[in-house]
């Protein structure tokens, strides 16, 4: 018999339920007690190297001491039994680990899947964390035969793939047992025919064919998975344009039985579409396959569906009897071009006179016209045909434009610059919106867009910058020519000015001073200047602030002290904050003009 260990703890490897009570007993060997001259009274219990209070001990007899824990909350407790030997030295007798956790809960939501070509896999919800090694066993049987147990692996404890091959059209019963050191529970049993749990392989070899006759259709063909010989399939077919992120779906009722091709209709011409397809058992019992690999195709071209936006500009410096007119138009977006644009056709007809034709590859045409009224038309052409014509009246030189839009407003919203107006009473064919950045350093380079005559609110479709002042002009266009333009200034987003105003004195008296300043250049304003503040002070005095309306460029400071040095600076404010200008100093005279000491 060995003196080491000097005793033992019972139970040796305890597993206890969390928040339960637990008692351990340390029994000393008689020879050890004899060697160390101790008995159970000398036992010291420790958990994780901390001494347990004596109140938790019970001396059972000369050789045995017990310790009781109530409401165990730790998952892992190192418990040691020690003896106080000669001179209060502690000698370890024995140690155990108390493992605590919870019994397994009844597994729930048991479900099985048969992936085509693979064996059946079942999964379940194992319930709460037990903090213990818990083994899950999937059990299955026919009415006449028990299958081998499927033991879930440690790294995937809530699923298991059976070892036997799937037989369709015979019902199977399946359940799960969960077991750990604290108990064993069984799930509800489920009974099913594996044919209702099939997840087919996705259709493959998906291909897309276009049609020369119809620019709005594409034909899909595919190869069905082998499971089609066991079950009838239904399909989901989804498609999107190449650049889109969301999918559209063919109505499911159109693809509700086994097939290997489908024609998709109502598509846009000359557009690349991406398709994918999946399938499942036609009665909806089972699982959808994964999506097939994507396949793409391009619909055939169609003639352009819309005439381009069309406008003109007249060079103000015109020679006697003639004027230079620049006709401008916008490239059609792909969904309206419906194919590769080949060229543009422009016709110009002088009022009740002969017609001139132009074929142009660019998006502008400069022509010399007489001072008469002209009718211009524009069509765009692709491989299939021509668009409808955009018609524009270029009025005679003496034409007086009237009927502007009313209540023109411009405002930023959702990172866009919106423009709205009240429509004139007269029938408007279209509106032309023009805008440019106002700058002291560069000319106003205009961008433009066209809106239908029914529109009275839109946003500027350009690359707009923050803290820039945009001059926006709205021109209504009538059958006989353009109406009067209306303009407004706006900012996409204001900021504080980049510089403050530079203040100076215009006139200084004994008790007052007239200050003046220049309006800030538009390039440094960064927004609408709403007001100015003048700050002035003496070397020893407090600062005084005076608010001044933004329309002013001078202001008189009164009640000043004579023969005194003043420091003054000025700030300009937009809706987003202010910026100070440089400080300026002046001294009031000791006497007023003509005054003697």
């Amino acid at each position: 018999e060995l003196l080491d260990p000097c005793g033992y703890i019972s139970p040796e490897s305890p597993v206890v339920q969390l928040h339960s009570n637990f008692t351990a007993v340390c029994v000393l060997k008689e020879k050890c007690m004899d060697y160390f001259h101790v008995n159970a009274n000398y036992i010291v219990w420790k958990t994780n190297h901390f001494t347990i209070p004596k109140e938790q001990y019970t001396i059972i007899n000369r050789t045995a001491s017990s310790v009781t824990f109530t409401d165990i909350a730790s998952l892992n407790i190192q418990l040691t039994c020690n003896i106080l030997t000669f001179g209060q030295l502690e000698q370890n007798v024995y140690g155990i680990t108390i493992i605590s956790g919870l019994p397994p809960e009844k597994p729930k939501n048991l479900s099985c899947i048969v992936n085509e070509g693979k064996k059946m896999r079942c999964e379940w919800d194992g319930g709460r964390e037990t903090h213990l090694e818990t083994n899950f066993t999937l059990k299955s049987e026919w009415a006449t035969h028990k299958f081998a147990d499927c033991k879930a692996k440690r790294d995937t404890p809530t699923s298991c793939t059976v070892d036997y091959s799937t037989v369709y059209f015979v019902n199977i019963e399946v359940w799960v047992e969960a077991e750990n050191a604290l108990g064993k529970v069984t799930s509800d049993h489920i009974n099913f025919d594996p044919v209702y749990k099939v997840k087919p392989n996705p259709p493959h070899n998906l291909s897309v064919i276009n049609s020369e006759e119809l620019s709005s259709i594409l034909k899909l063909t595919w190869t069905n998975p082998s499971i089609k010989s066991v079950i009838i399939l239904k399909y989901n077919i989804q498609y999107r344009t190449k650049d889109a992120s969301t999918w559209s779906q063919i109505p499911p009722e159109d693809t509700a039985s086994t097939r290997s091709s489908f024609t998709v209709q109502d598509l846009k011409p000359f557009t690349e579409y991406v398709f994918r397809i999946r399938c499942m058992k036609e009665d909806g019992k089972g699982y959808w396959s994964d999506w097939s690999e994507e396949a793409s195709g391009i619909t055939y071209e169609d003639r352009p569906s819309k005439a381009p936006s069309f406008w003109y500009k007249i060079d103000p410096s015109h020679t006697q009897g003639y004027r230079t007119v620049q006709l401008v138009w916008k490239t059609l977006p792909p969904f309206e071009a419906n194919g590769k644009i080949l060229d543009y056709e422009v016709t110009l007809t002088r009022w009740k006179s002969h017609l001139q034709n132009y074929t142009v590859n660019a998006t502008k045409l400069t022509v010399n016209l007489t001072n008469d009224r002209y009718l211009a038309t524009l069509t765009v052409r692709n491989l299939v045909g021509k668009s409808d014509a955009a018609v524009l009246t270029i009025p005679a030189c003496d034409f007086q434009a009237t009927h502007p839009v009313m209540d023109l407003k411009a405002f930023p919203k959702d990172n866009m610059l919106w423009v709205e107006w009240t429509t004139p009473r007269e029938s408007v064919k279209k509106y032309i919106l023009e805008w440019c950045v106002l700058s002291d350093k560069a000319p106003c380079i205009t961008d433009w867009q066209q809106e239908d005559g029914t529109v009275h609110r839109t946003y500027l479709r350009g690359n707009l910058a923050e803290s820039k002042c945009y001059l926006i002009t709205v021109t209504p266009v009538y059958a006989d020519g353009p109406g009067s333009p209306e303009s407004i200034k706006a900012y996409l987003k204001q900021a504080p000015p980049s510089k403050g105003p530079t203040v100076r004195t215009k006139k200084v008296g004994k008790n007052e001073a007239v200050l003046e300043w220049d309006q800030l250049p538009v390039d440094v304003q960064n927004g609408f200047i709403r007001n100015y503040t003048i700050f002035y002070r003496t070397i020893i005095g407090n600062e005084t602030a005076v608010n001044v309306d933004s329309s002013h460029t001078e202001y008189t400071l009164s009640s000043l002290t004579s023969d005194t040095l003043y420091m003054v600076r000025m700030a300009a404010y937009t809706d987003e904050g202010g910026k100070d200008g440089p400080e300026f100093t002046f001294t009031t005279p000791k006497f007023a003009q003509g005054e003697i000491e």
């Epitope: 018999e1 060995l2 003196l3 080491d4 008689e30 020879k31 004899d34 060697y35 160390f36 001259h37 008995n39 000369r62 030997t85 000669f86």
Partner: antibody, heavy 115, light 108 residues
Framework: QVQLVQSGAEVKKPGASVKVSCKAS????????ISWVRQAPGQGLEWMGW????????DYAQKFQGRVTMTTDTSTSTAYMELRSLRSDDTAVYYC????????WGQGTLVTVSS | DIQMTQSPSSLSASVGDRVTITCRAS??????LNWYQQKPGKAPKLLIY???SLQSGVPSRFSGSGSGTDFTLTISSLQPEDFATYYC??????????FGQGTRLEIK
Amino acid sequence: QVQLVQSGAEVKKPGASVKVSCKASGYTFTSLGISWVRQAPGQGLEWMGWISAYSGNRDYAQKFQGRVTMTTDTSTSTAYMELRSLRSDDTAVYYCARSLRFDYWGQGTLVTVSS
Amino acid sequence: DIQMTQSPSSLSASVGDRVTITCRASQSISSYLNWYQQKPGKAPKLLIYAASSLQSGVPSRFSGSGSGTDFTLTISSLQPEDFATYYCQQSYSTPPITFGQGTRLEIK
């Protein structure tokens, strides 16, 4: 203070038995065991066995198994060691010692085995 | 059985010397080793128990060390009354308890 007092010297004939006593005082007799050790003339120490004064459990060295008996009388705080079938090589000083630590020893009892 | 081997079996030293006696166990005995001193005609006396604990009443010049299989008894400064025979003994495995063969310490 702790004392272990042994019985006096004995002379025995081969084949006879000897019973040596060891009276303990100065501590609680039942709290610790008694070990027996002998030492032949000019030789080293040889452990014979141990008895628990509390439970009466005992351990004997293999060499003495069947020939030795160790007992205690708690009423008198005395331990006894009886060795039977004595041989001449059993001639030695027999010591009792307290516990398995041998922290206190008796004065020794000389047992001479001679024909 | 566990064999205990002491070395040297005898040694000569002078008063004031530092003396070391070693004891080797044939297998690990943890720290369950005691050292005894025996003078002629007297019962042995416990010096050190549990490898390094000094028995009460024993002078502090005696010290013990070691664990497992190798142990040492050291007398830091030899006194005239220290000339005797010294035994090591293991209590780890019982039965049997075993002693070393002894080391005789003589005056040089």
